[in-house]
């Protein structure tokens, strides 16, 4: 599976979501949904 990486928000490692404090704007990608700040 692809690993999603962003300036802030979260990353996916081994299909586990790891959250960070900063919000991610939807201008950085598509909103994944049903999570916090997740875009891709």
């Amino acid at each position: 599976d692809a690993e999603f990486r962003h300036d802030s928000g979260y990353e996916v490692h081994h299909q586990k979501l790891v959250f960070f404090a900063e919000d991610v704007g939807s201008n950085k990608g598509a909103i994944i949904g049903l999570m916090v700040g997740g875009v891709v």
């Epitope: 692809a2 979501l17 990608g29 598509a30 994944i32 949904g33 049903l34 700040g37 997740g38 891709v40």
Partner: antibody
Framework: QVQLVQSGAEVKKPGASVKVSCKAS????????IHWVRQAPGQGLEWMGF????????NYNQKFKGRVTMTRDTSTSTVYMELSSLRSEDTAVYYC??????????????WGQGTLVTVSS | DIVMTQSPDSLAVSLGERATINCRAS??????????LNWYQQKPGQPPKLLIY???KQGTGVPDRFSGSGSGTDFTLTISSLQAEDVAVYYC?????????FGGGTKVEIK
Amino acid sequence: QVQLVQSGAEVKKPGASVKVSCKASGYTFTTYAIHWVRQAPGQGLEWMGFTSPYSGVSNYNQKFKGRVTMTRDTSTSTVYMELSSLRSEDTAVYYCARFDNFDRGYVRDYWGQGTLVTVSS
Amino acid sequence: DIVMTQSPDSLAVSLGERATINCRASESVDNDRISFLNWYQQKPGQPPKLLIYAATKQGTGVPDRFSGSGSGTDFTLTISSLQAEDVAVYYCQQSKEFPWSFGGGTKVEIK
């Protein structure tokens, strides 16, 4: 208003492939991932994966790895889900869906009407 | 993968009475004080509809009689006063990890 409109019912032979489309309207296509969920007759819901219209990146349920491909066409605001090597157990209604994130102050979901795929010899 | 287990499989409740559905996750679906647990209602021939997200928050336009509770691995959906239009199948779902997974569903009927 937000709409997800799916392609029509399909009947396929075992071993064949099917490609279901989901055309989005009423919002900026690239701002939301599109998820695919299927439901076999009389059974529960099964998440298949999602694709990002923004980046083209997809994430698939490992159960379908190697058999499912999700793509998008930004020129027509359409997402596609292709499932190959079909077997009878793939007979199901296939839904596309869009969800808000928890941090947006409101959370709505939008679903396509569903596409029945029947796999039969 | 996280496995979601619902109980009971079916439930018959009198109109105006309370209906309670349980959902258990094989591991915690909490992260940073948020429970990534959602509830859906599905009526025959229709797609699912999101009722409750983040364990306790009502989806847009969802009647107040629907409420959710729980954290960690154990969650509950409550319909405080069952109405005829609530006859449906209800599913829990976790969105903490990929692959997202659903419970097997609970069919709610009128007694």
